[in-house]
């Protein structure tokens, strides 16, 4: 039931990568409109994306706030020429998502090999400490800063004309590996928080090989 | 430990009025919405209000909207439920529950019992 | 406002039984809903939330199910620890409480 030809938005789910946090959901409006709410465990309730046609809302300014809070949001629907109407409840027709604690659960980005430095048979590769949109003291953090030791990355590495790769990790974002002098080495990372339950990893970084722009080679 | 301790309940003449305290520990008080729910005496549950937790936002049942004010001071972790123009049916047993998002109650206190009565 | 109709009012069982309480809202309330049981002179206690999920700490035994306007909770096996009454609670517009269901020996 609910306000004539309004329908119940569906399918709410949250899209978030280092705290960049958007919530979407169901159906496409036909002559109607959503405003979204999202709140703490505390129940204030904050409006977002007012009387909008778009299925997406960002709610990334909300969730940085706190990011171990634990976030519900709800999607309102109102008749698209008369935001005033409400259900059968004496309210707007709405649904809740699912709930919603962004350090547990935004998925971990792409990580960057920002760079790779030979000396002898040492390699010093250097992960991108990636920036988010979590702010302190008018700051943005990085992920590192958010992280902390909750946060590994782990270095997949082999010679460039083998398979068999070898694995590294570190609690920085500098990795120290063992090479052969004057083989070539190729490598990827990924960042991991071990602790979690979901979206442990992140997907792999681009593959970096010795030998590219963005190596340096001492003796 | 989560505790919620209910405080100043009593019996009071029809027409009068009371106010019910709830004492919060073990959790961080203003991170919750809170809610106030009565029981009459053999009945069931029923709702009278809840409060968020900055208590910029708060919610009444029908039967006492008007009547009773829902309110929360942070600093001292309490919560309160100022009662007036009492009636006979308002005898119940309160209790004060932990609200998260203000939808359900994960956590109650034992409750104070009120009693309208000439 | 939305109405909460349980049944049995009182169910009569034996430790061991599975007991199936029935919940029905007078429109149709996603899944918020929440179980509640309450043992005489004592204050309620939450067991399910959401429908289905279960309350830290409250036994396996316990469980939730529905959607929309039909909801059970389901004790797979009766323990002398369960003989009370039990609420259904919705919180998709304000709250309501169901009537209860009284859980009694046979």
């Known amino acids: 039931s609910g306000t004539t030809n309004t329908v119940a938005a569906y399918n709410l789910t949250w899209k978030s990568t280092n705290f960049k946090t958007i919530l979407e959901w169901e159906p496409k409006p036909v002559n109607q409109v959503y405003t979204v709410q999202i709140s703490t465990k505390s129940g204030d309730w904050k409006s977002k994306c007012f009387y909008t046609t778009d299925t997406e809302c960002d709610l990334t300014d909300e969730i940085v706030k706190d990011v171990k809070q634990t976030y519900l949001a709800r999607v309102f629907s109102y008749p698209a020429g008369n935001v005033e109407s409400t259900g059968s409840a004496g309210e707007p027709l709405y649904e809740n998502s699912p709930e919603f604690t962004p350090y547990l659960e935004t998925n971990l980005g792409q990580p960057t090999i920002q760079s790779f430095e030979q000396v002898g048979t040492k390699v010093n590769v250097t992960v991108e400490d990636e920036r988010t949109l979590v702010r302190r003291n008018n700051t943005f953090l990085s992920l590192r800063d958010v992280f902390g030791k909750d946060l590994i990355y782990t270095l997949y590495y082999w010679k460039d004309s083998s398979t068999g790769r070898k694995t590294n990790t570190t609690h920085t974002n500098e990795f120290l590996i063992d090479v052969e002098k004057g083989v070539s080495y190729c490598f990827f990372a990924q960042a991991v928080i071990p602790s979690r339950t979901v979206n442990r990893k992140s997907t792999d970084s681009p593959v970096e090989c010795m030998g590219q722009e963005k190596g340096e080679f001492r003796e | 430990e989560v505790q919620l301790l209910e405080s100043g309940g009593g019996l009071v003449q029809p027409g009068g009025s009371l106010r019910l305290s709830c004492a919060a520990s073990?959790?961080?008080?203003?991170?919750?919405?809170m809610g106030w729910v009565r029981q009459a005496p053999g009945k069931g549950l029923e709702w009278v209000s809840t409060i968020s937790g900055s208590g910029g936002l708060t919610y009444y049942a029908d039967s006492v909207k008007g009547r009773f004010t829902i309110s929360r001071d942070n600093s001292k972790n309490t919560l309160y439920l100022q009662m007036n123009s009492l009636r006979a049916e308002d005898t119940a047993v309160y209790y004060c529950?932990?609200?998260?998002?203000?939808?359900?109650?994960?956590?109650w206190g034992k409750g104070t019992t009120v009693t309208v009565s000439s | 406002d939305i109405q909460m109709t349980q049944s049995p009012s009182t169910l009569s069982a034996s430790v061991g039984d599975r007991v199936t309480i029935t919940c029905r809202a007078s429109q149709s309330i996603s899944s918020w809903l929440a179980w509640y049981q309450q043992k005489p002179g004592k204050a309620p206690k939450l067991l399910i939330y959401k429908a289905s999920s279960l309350e830290s700490g409250v036994p396996s035994r316990f469980s939730g199910s529905g959607s929309g306007t039909e909801f059970t909770l389901t004790i797979s096996s009766l323990q002398p620890d369960d003989f009370a009454t039990y609420y259904c609670q919705q919180y998709k517009s304000y709250i309501t409480f169901g009537g209860g269901t009284k859980v009694e020996i046979k």
């Open positions: 073990g959790f961080t008080f203003s991170d919750y919405a």
């Open positions: 529950a932990k609200a998260p998002y203000g939808y359900y109650m994960d956590v």
